[in-house]
């Protein structure tokens, strides 16, 4: 969370941003809020990126003006125009690229004053893992797959019964480059699993951490997955 202040005459306006992460190839949001101003035509929103000449996006007089926009953002940006009057200056970013990572500035000017705040935007790839019982293996195994990760993550297994056990000797992890030659498919196999136990497959890089749990009993298989973005907020 970053809060910036600005001065216009005697007026401060508070601008607040949140560090966030973008999933490459997907759509992202760069969050920014400011003190609302009912005079829409008097609001100017400018998004800038460190090291880039030209703007990422500009919204003024109630509409977009991309005449100063840098080419790398062409056709990929929009503000939530109907939410500007209530103080939302967040930026939609289409088709997030690895090169979109960096420091952005959200600059606001209203009839109350002006202000700005920076945010760090991280980019990578992250996806939910899915764990299945691998019945084809000679001994009962678990197969954990996640379709898109970047940078290359670490993969670790854990078990509810054998807490603290190191499964690296009885697991095998591979990374397969996807067709766009950036992201990778993660596949990890855990061998010699026992029933009536809950196993967890944990995939983590510097952007996200994902966990897939599977409980195997004689009568059923229960699965659960979760994904958490790191260092955001």
């Amino acid at each position: 969370l970053i809060i910036g202040f600005g001065i216009s005459g005697k007026h401060f306006i508070t601008v607040t941003t949140f560090t966030s992460a973008g999933n490459i190839g997907e759509d992202g949001t760069l969050s920014c809020t400011f003190e609302p101003d009912i005079k829409l035509n008097g609001i100017v929103i400018q998004w800038l990126k460190e090291g880039i000449k030209g703007l990422v996006h500009e919204f003024k007089e109630g509409k977009d003006d991309l005449s100063q926009q840098h080419e790398m953002f062409r056709g990929r940006t929009a503000v939530f125009a109907d939410q500007v009057v209530v103080g939302n200056a967040s930026l939609r970013l289409k088709n997030v690229q690895l090169t979109d990572a960096g420091t952005y500035t959200c600059y606001i000017r209203t009839s109350k004053g002006k202000g700005n705040a920076n945010l760090e935007y991280k980019t990578g790839a992250f996806s939910m893992p899915e764990i299945n019982v691998d019945y084809n293996a000679s001994s009962e195994s678990l197969r954990c797959e996640a379709p898109r990760w970047f940078p290359q993550p670490t993969v670790a297994w854990a078990s509810q019964v054998d807490q603290g056990a190191n499964f690296s000797e009885v697991s095998n992890t591979s990374f397969e480059l996807n067709s766009e030659n950036v992201t990778m498919k993660v596949v990890s196999v855990l061998y010699n699993v026992t029933i009536n136990n809950t196993y967890s497959c944990m995939i983590e890089n510097d952007i996200a951490k994902a966990t897939g749990d599977i409980k195997v009993t004689d009568s059923e298989v229960k699965r659960r997955s979760q994904l958490q973005l790191l260092n955001s907020g």
């Epitope: 190839g25 991309l66 005449s67 100063q68 926009q69 940006t77 929009a78 289409k94 088709n95």
Partner: antibody, heavy 121, light 107 residues
């Protein structure tokens, strides 16, 4: 409401330059919320996006045509134009001008009627 | 470039039929997909944008679904004026590309 109308010669000789203009009526090309595109359709075939322009003059072209295409804008006349150089019979098509529905959506919500351009000697 | 593959290339149907057209992208395009209707001698008309949003003025019998690589256009009850060619278009990545079209013909 906003309307688009293509104009230009219907017949162009091989190796020459195809020139078309799209006139926007009922709204200003400078309003800032849109990109303006050219799209073509070969006889009996599918659609091919040629490129687009913003009112400020910044352009983006389809890489397959980039070396031959120029799109320009004249805000005083509320027009944007297409030039395609070194044409061959393969450039015979119906050429449409269109408006992208927003600066991010990149779908085409308004189209001109289209104009058939034949490349023949 | 992202390739857009439509199927079938043509379909014969009767008034009142439910018609489904599919479009597959060669790579993920999130929900950045539009559908158009084109009648002979006319310009295409936008029906659906953002995969499932109905363009203003388009009848509710048209609907779109899908995300990622697989998308569907459905006409719930075919009307006489719906006999036309339908195109999908990806709006995710330059250059924007269209599918080859699906012709809906009278059975």
């Amino acid at each position: 409401q906003v309307q688009l109308q293509e104009s230009g010669p219907g017949l162009v000789k091989p190796s020459q330059t195809l020139s078309l203009t799209c006139t926007v009526s009922g709204g200003s090309i400078s309003s800032g919320g849109y990109y303006w595109s050219w799209i073509r359709q070969h006889p009996g075939k599918g659609l091919e996006w040629i490129g687009n322009i913003y009112y400020s003059g910044s352009t983006y072209y389809n890489p397959s045509l980039k070396s031959r295409v120029t799109i320009s804008v004249d805000t005083s006349k509320n027009q944007f134009s297409l030039k395609l150089s070194s044409v061959t019979a393969a450039d015979t098509a119906v050429y449409y001008c269109a408006r992208e529905s927003s600066t991010i959506s990149a779908d085409f919500d308004l189209w001109g009627r289209g104009t058939l351009v034949t490349v023949s000697s | 470039d992202i390739q857009m593959t439509q199927s079938p290339s043509s379909v014969s149907a009767s008034v009142g039929d439910r018609v489904t057209i599919t479009c597959r992208a060669s790579q993920g395009i999130s929900r950045w997909l539009a559908w158009y209707q084109q009648k002979p001698g006319k310009a295409p008309k936008l029906l659906i944008y953002a995969a499932s949003s109905l363009q203003s003025g388009v009848p509710s019998r048209f609907s779109g679904s899908g995300s990622g690589t697989d998308f569907t256009l459905t006409i719930s009850s075919l009307q006489p004026e719906d006999f036309a060619t339908y195109y999908c278009q990806q709006a995710h990545t330059f250059p924007y590309t269209f599918g080859g079209g699906t012709k809906v013909e009278i059975k």
